[in-house]
Interface confidence: low
């Protein structure tokens, strides 16, 4: 797959034109470069310890693999080694770089390939067989579950629709937040690039169901998250009556504070 990186192709050309003359008998140049190119192309035939190799990588994995290869190729050419020793060293290096690339690919397949647990993620991948870049849709269940949110009355409600893979996904459009009513109707509350919906100083009327939808270029939503918002009763200060007996030196102006929820009828009256 590293052959898909133009800098690797350039480095191999430079090896042929700039390094081989003066370091290897001219009659071996053609056969040598064929072997080198085959060895580099052979990077696509990987045997991974646990997973089957899928034959695709992302840009970051390709860059990592090619940078590692180029670094070691430079070490060899900088050493000015010649003849059989050069050939031997070069092919050892290519073998070990293939091993290294296999570890990068294994990590990519485990951690970075379709990392979304739900929704649809669009990921640009490089197909090693033909070096083509294509956008791959990682399709999981659209529904990314439900979140229960509790907000004390008069505080800010924040509904966060962002999932860790959203930043890495391509083709995402807008976050839309809907207020969902009991009779299967809904109202669009906000739409835009902001992944959170913030409602300052919530009241009891803000309790209920909300839905977030993240749109994507291929029309189907990338993510759907449902929120169930509970507005907790406001905590108020209430003065306790002072005790009848006042001991000498005791302050009478201070009262102890207890936190009590609003009575239901008071809550209704506040609407």
């Amino acid at each position: 797959c590293v052959i898909c990186d133009p800098s690797v192709v350039l480095a191999l050309k430079s090896l042929e034109k700039d390094y081989l003359p003066g370091h290897l008998d001219a009659k071996h140049h053609k056969a040598m470069m064929e072997r080198v190119e085959n060895a580099v192309k052979d990077f696509q035939e990987l045997s991974l310890n646990e997973d089957a190799y899928m034959g695709v990588v992302d840009e970051a994995t390709l860059q990592k693999g090619s940078w590692s290869l180029l670094k070691d190729l430079k070490r060899i050419t900088d050493s000015d080694v010649k003849g059989d020793l050069f050939v031997k060293e070069l092919f050892w290096m290519l073998h070990l770089q293939k091993e290294t690339f296999a570890t990068y690919v294994a990590r990519f397949q485990k951690e970075a390939y379709c990392p979304n647990k739900c929704g649809v993620m669009l990921q640009t991948l490089i197909w090693c067989k033909n070096c083509k870049k294509e956008v791959h849709a990682c399709r999981k269940s659209y529904d990314c579950g439900e979140r229960n949110v509790e907000v004390p009355q008069m505080e800010d409600m924040i509904l966060d629709c962002e999932l860790n893979w959203h930043q890495a996904s391509e083709g995402l459009t807008d976050y839309s937040f809907y207020r969902v009513w009991g009779n299967n109707t809904e109202t669009l509350v906000s739409k835009g690039k902001e992944a959170t919906l913030t409602k300052p100083m919530v009241g009891p009327e803000d309790a209920g169901s909300y839905r977030c939808e993240l749109g994507s270029v291929n029309s189907s939503p990338a993510t759907i998250i449902n929120f169930h918002v509970t507005v907790l009763p406001k905590m108020i200060k209430e003065e306790k009556p002072s005790p009848n007996i006042v001991t000498p030196g005791e302050a009478t102006t201070e009262s102890s504070i207890s936190l009590q929820p609003l009575q239901p009828e008071k809550m209704l009256a506040s609407r």
Epitope: I76, S79, L85, E89
Partner: nanobody, 117 residues
Amino acid sequence: QVQLVESGGGLVQPGGSLRLSCAASGFTFSNDAMTWVRQAPGKALEWVSSITLLGGGIPYYSDTVKGRFTISRDNTKNMLYLQMNSLKPEDTAVYYCAKGFKSDYPRGQGTQVTVSS
């Protein structure tokens, strides 16, 4: 014929260090890459580190040991070394040195490394 004799293994506590040695004979040591591989009980053979020839040898390490192990060679003495620092229980295995860079090349009898408290 090729002879490789490993030594330096033993029992060590987690976080400790060991230095493995491999005495090579029966081939031109300075003309070959050398490799350390290991095999934990019931597990497959695992590549640990290789060293090539140039400039005293270019080292390569597996991700599991990178930053903790150091491979080196002394061509004048036909010796290969593996300095193992910050050892972990999962480093427990029989360690073999091998001629060349593949784990299926000729290798020695191995030396047991046990990391345990």
